[in-house]
């Protein structure tokens, strides 16, 4: 998965109402014992920085060593910096931990760009702003890396929350969340609320700001509005889902739905952008261009190379279309749609040279490995990874950035036939790149 994302809302901003919150709806679903309610200690436990990932504080070893760890639903290894590196403020020192156990086994993880390698072991791990438990988990101690750690990102490791099938070196290495569920009474479910800022943040603002919440073992209903809609997890490797229809401002892209999931569609908190297969990307850009044709944007903007800027507070959100992805529902022939705003897919960027303006990067890009629903999508929604019931839930996030005219939405049901045909069956070969 590509690291990347953007960050939270703060109050006290003059100008446009970037951070409007939606009121809580009153029609609640019936409580599911032990799975819903309040998780006060876990709310606001994530921080992050634009394009560089959301991280949670974790402790490793005895006595505990505190590290910031990137939350990544697109990989399955718990891996931490364990040697000095120019981009790391701190790292895991195994020799200082009395509970560290060496597995005498190496791990090498190549990505499309870059790699990390290290030594496998186990140690005691806990999440200070998480469930009050300590688990013995597999840890990859990263001893060498290339293009992995990000200068100034403030995280020192990665928490892969996907399934064992894509763990390295192989699926026998139990991922952290599996260990947590096995060793404790924590329900087999977690949920993420990633809060995009709607404006760029400098380093000091990032360190002082809230980036969202990872609720481990449950659902906190203060974090969303309306109802949760669930889509099946197609296969337990990545968090794979099926997209059955795509609309730009309500206009169907009219593609064979297999194209939307070629070669897979995944929900990935470790990727910044909404990434789309080449054909879908081209059709989507063509449609977004047409919808926003009152202004002429440079070709480089659609490529993610050029920024576009407007005088502070004058961004014409209304000229940009909303994007709806229809996801397979839990009931036969039933789908639901999630709709994001330009406030999600135009990523605010701070540039000293143009600091008097509000500048943005187009955060939809082309993929050769299928659709990746990265932060651009997730920042609009509260996303429930219900592993126990093999499904992913979406509801409108209480912290999503919007304006007075439009909000993100989760709506259904819609009748959609032959949705199974939308899934692409990958020829069985080893997936050799997680980070694409």
């Amino acid at each position: 998965t590509q690291h990347g994302i953007r960050l939270p809302l703060r109050s006290g901003l003059g100008g446009a109402p970037l951070g409007l919150r939606l009121p809580r709806e009153t029609d609640e679903e019936p409580e599911e014992p032990g799975r819903r309610g309040s998780f006060v200690e876990m709310v606001d436990n994530l921080r992050g920085k634009s394009g560089q990932g959301y991280y949670v504080e974790m402790t490793v070893g005895s006595p505990p060593q505190t590290l910031n760890i990137l939350v990544d639903t697109g990989s399955s290894n718990f891996a931490v910096g364990a040697a000095p590196h120019p981009f790391l403020h701190r790292y895991y020192q195994r020799q200082l931990s009395s509970t560290y156990r060496d597995l005498r086994k190496g791990v090498y993880v190549p990505y499309t760009q870059g790699k990390w390698e290290g030594e496998l072991g186990t140690d005691l791990v806990s999440i200070p702003h998480g469930p009050n438990v300590t688990v013995r988990a597999n840890i990859a101690a990263i001893t060498e890396s290339d293009k992995f750690f990000i200068n100034g990102s403030n995280w020192e490791g990665i928490l892969g929350l996907a399934y064992a099938e894509i763990a390295r070196p192989d699926d026998s290495l139990e991922p952290f969340f599996d260990s947590l569920v096995k060793q404790t009474h924590v329900p087999n479910l977690f949920s993420l609320q990633l809060c995009g800022a709607g404006f760029p943040l400098n380093q000091s603002e990032v360190l002082a700001s809230v980036g969202g919440s990872m609720i481990i073992g449950g659902i906190d209903h203060s974090l969303y509005t309306g109802s949760l809609w669930y889509t099946p997890i197609r296969r337990e490797w990545y968090y794979e889902v099926i997209i059955v229809r795509v609309e730009i401002n309500g206009q169907d892209l009219k593609m064979d739905c297999k194209e939307y999931n070629y070669d897979k569609s995944i929900v990935d908190s470790g990727t910044t952008n909404l990434r789309l297969p080449k054909k879908v990307f081209e059709a989507a850009v063509k449609s977004i261009k047409a919808a926003s044709s009152t202004e002429k944007f440079p070709d480089g903007f659609w490529l993610g190379e050029q920024l576009v800027c407007w005088q502070a507070g004058t961004t014409p959100w209304n000229i940009f279309p909303v994007i709806s992805l229809y996801l397979m529902g839990e009931v036969t022939n039933q789908s639901f749609r999630i709709t994001i705003l330009p406030q999600q897919y135009l990523r605010p960027v701070e540039d000293v040279a143009t600091s008097q303006d509000d500048c943005y990067k187009f955060a939809i890009s082309q993929s050769s490995t299928g659709t990746v629903m990265g932060a651009v999508i997730m920042e609009g929604f509260y996303v429930v990874f219900d592993r126990a019931r093999k499904r992913i839930g979406f509801a409108v996030s209480a912290c999503h950035v919007h304006d007075e005219f439009r909000t993100a939405a989760v709506e259904g049901p819609f009748v959609t036939l032959d949705m199974e045909d939308c899934g692409y069956n990958i020829p069985q070969t080893d997936e050799s790149t997680l980070m694409t």
């Epitope: 200068n151 002429k296 440079p298 070709d299 480089g300 050029q306 920024l307 040279a353």
Partner: antibody
Framework: EVQLQQPGAEVVRPGTSVKLSCKAS????????MHWVKQRPGQGLEWIGM????????KYNQKLKGKATLTVDTSSSTANMHVNSLTSEDSAVYFC?????????WGQGTLVTVSA | DILMTQSQKFMSTSVGDRVSVTCKAS??????VAWYQQISGQSPKPLIY???HRYSGVPDRFTGSGSGTDFTLTISNVQSEDLVEFFC?????????FGGGTKLEIK
């Protein structure tokens, strides 16, 4: 403060090649594309191409027909341009420039002199 | 490729004057034009982006205007340090192209 550092000058023989560097600092290197621009003595500016340091995607000016190859080394936040089969026509100042809106930041340029 | 034409290679002006440098694109580039100032032997210094927006720190005597195919950089109250070369650039489509430059000279 954004800075792009380039060596001042390179003297090279005709028919050989040269690797020019551009070390970036003051921003997250992988967040912005890097461009290269050529300026022959007393002449205008010519865009050579660009590279996205996050995934090594490149785009070149087709007029220059394989004359340059762009690479990056993210571990040192450095963009490189390899110019091959040098002739007197390649004697020029080569600038790196960071994207944003147009090119808000430029390196000081490297003067390449092709001389026997 | 889009051709950017700065028809005047040289322009004569005096300190304190107002001068307009023009640039014409061979096809519609919207407002995706930048202007740079270059002192001989130095790198170009960015002045204007999006046809009319000043980069941070650029004095307000520099004003950009235009859209489509015709663009103008106006310098009011010309200072001695402005007697250098100015280039326009289109960044609307690849390959990015520059005008041939206009040098301001003392009358």
């Amino acid at each position: 403060e954004v800075q792009l550092q380039q060596p001042g000058a390179e003297v090279v023989r005709p028919g050989t090649s040269v690797k020019l560097s551009c070390k970036a600092s003051g921003y997250t290197f992988t967040n912005y594309w890097m461009h290269w621009v050529k300026q022959r003595p007393g002449q205008g500016l010519e865009w050579i191409g660009m590279i996205d340091p996050s995934d090594n995607y490149t785009k070149y000016n087709q007029k220059l027909k394989g004359k340059a190859t762009l690479t990056v080394d993210t571990s040192s936040s450095t963009a490189n341009m390899h110019v091959n089969s040098l002739t007197s026509e390649d004697s020029a100042v080569y600038f790196c420039a960071r994207s944003g809106v147009a090119f808000p930041y430029w390196g000081q340029g490297t003067l390449v002199t092709v001389s026997a | 490729d889009i051709l950017m034409t700065q028809s005047q290679k040289f322009m004569s002006t005096s300190v304190g004057d107002r001068v307009s440098v023009t640039c014409k694109a061979s096809q519609n580039v919207g407002r995706n034009v930048a202007w740079y100032q270059q002192i001989s032997g130095q790198s170009p210094k960015p002045l204007i982006y999006s046809a009319s927006h000043r980069y941070s720190g650029v004095p307000d005597r520099f004003t950009g205007s235009g859209s489509g195919t015709d663009f103008t950089l106006t310098i009011s109250n010309v200072q001695s340090e402005d007697l250098v070369e100015f280039f326009c650039q289109q960044y609307n489509s690849y390959p990015y192209t520059f005008g041939g430059g206009t040098k301001l000279e003392i009358k």
